[in-house]
Interface confidence: low
Amino acid sequence: ATCYCRTGRCATRESLSGVCEISGRLYRLCCR
């Protein structure tokens, strides 16, 4: 599956590590 980090209103960022993490905090991840 390809996973994406959701940022802002419409940007999608592919997450290669399979997590969306900033400074140890996890954020919304969408995998499809």
Epitope: T2, C5, T7, G8, R9, C10, A11, T12, R13, E14, S15, L16, S17, V19, C20, E21, I22, R25, Y27
Partner: antibody, heavy 119, light 111 residues
């Protein structure tokens, strides 16, 4: 150490196509994205798009859709950008840059490739 | 697209003094309590170099003379004290929304 080595300067005719390369070393190529950025002489920076070498997935700035095509070869750790239907507006320095994972900024840059489009 | 407006376009500062560069976004670049604004330094004939990421985080190897602050739409890069090696053009860049965009640049010179 992380390095992005770009191909040499190019001179191309209007209407032609050109393929620029960016060879990565010093890190796992498939663990980061690669973006391409355009800079016209004496001007600012424009994000063209990015490719994730592991999946081959690409994301483009709408402005450059149909102009730029991004590809990557995992076996040689090299990213490519093909520019088509060249005009004088495409004359610029093109940089490749490594994308930080997930919430990206550009943490390492190639030295740039100068493209001159002239008849 | 999010438009980033930098000011001033050029700046002359005496050695040892403080340089302040502003970047204003046409809409908020904040998400999840973080600001997705970054700063780069570019010297003639060289690629840009990352200085500050997510508004206020100093990139590894960058001197502590460089600092960043701000949130939502208003951001500042401060260099204090300015050294001769800081002569360059400075760009802000947002990654909160596609397409990623850059400011027009601020050229720093020594007075």
């Amino acid at each position: 150490q992380v390095q992005l080595q770009q191909s040499g300067a190019e001179l191309a005719r209007p209407g032609a196509s050109v393929k620029l390369s960016c060879k990565a070393s010093g890190y796992t190529f498939t663990s980061y994205g690669i973006s391409w950025v355009k800079q016209r002489t004496g001007q600012g920076l424009e994000w063209i798009g990015e490719i994730y070498p592991r999946s081959g997935n690409t994301y483009y700035n709408e402005k450059f859709k149909g102009k730029a095509t991004l590809t990557a070869d995992k076996s040689s750790s090299t990213a490519y950008m093909q520019l088509s239907s060249l005009t004088s507006e495409d004359s610029a320095v093109y940089f490749c840059a490594r994308d930080y994972d997930g919430f990206p900024y550009f943490d390492y840059w190639g030295q740039g490739t100068t493209l001159t489009v002239s008849s | 697209d999010i438009v980033l407006t930098q000011s001033p376009a050029s700046l002359a500062v005496s050695l040892g003094q403080r340089a302040t560069i502003s970047c204003r976004a046409s809409e908020s670049v904040d998400s999840y309590g973080y600001s997705f604004m970054h700063w780069y330094q570019q010297k003639p004939g060289q690629p840009p170099k990352l200085l500050i990421y997510r508004a206020s985080n100093l990139e590894s190897g960058i001197p502590a003379r460089f600092s960043g602050s701000g949130s939502r739409t208003d951001f500042t890069l401060t260099i204090n004290p300015v050294e001769a090696d800081d002569v360059a053009t400075y760009y802000c860049q947002q990654s909160n929304e596609d397409p990623r965009t850059f400011g027009g640049g601020t050229k720093l010179e020594i007075k």
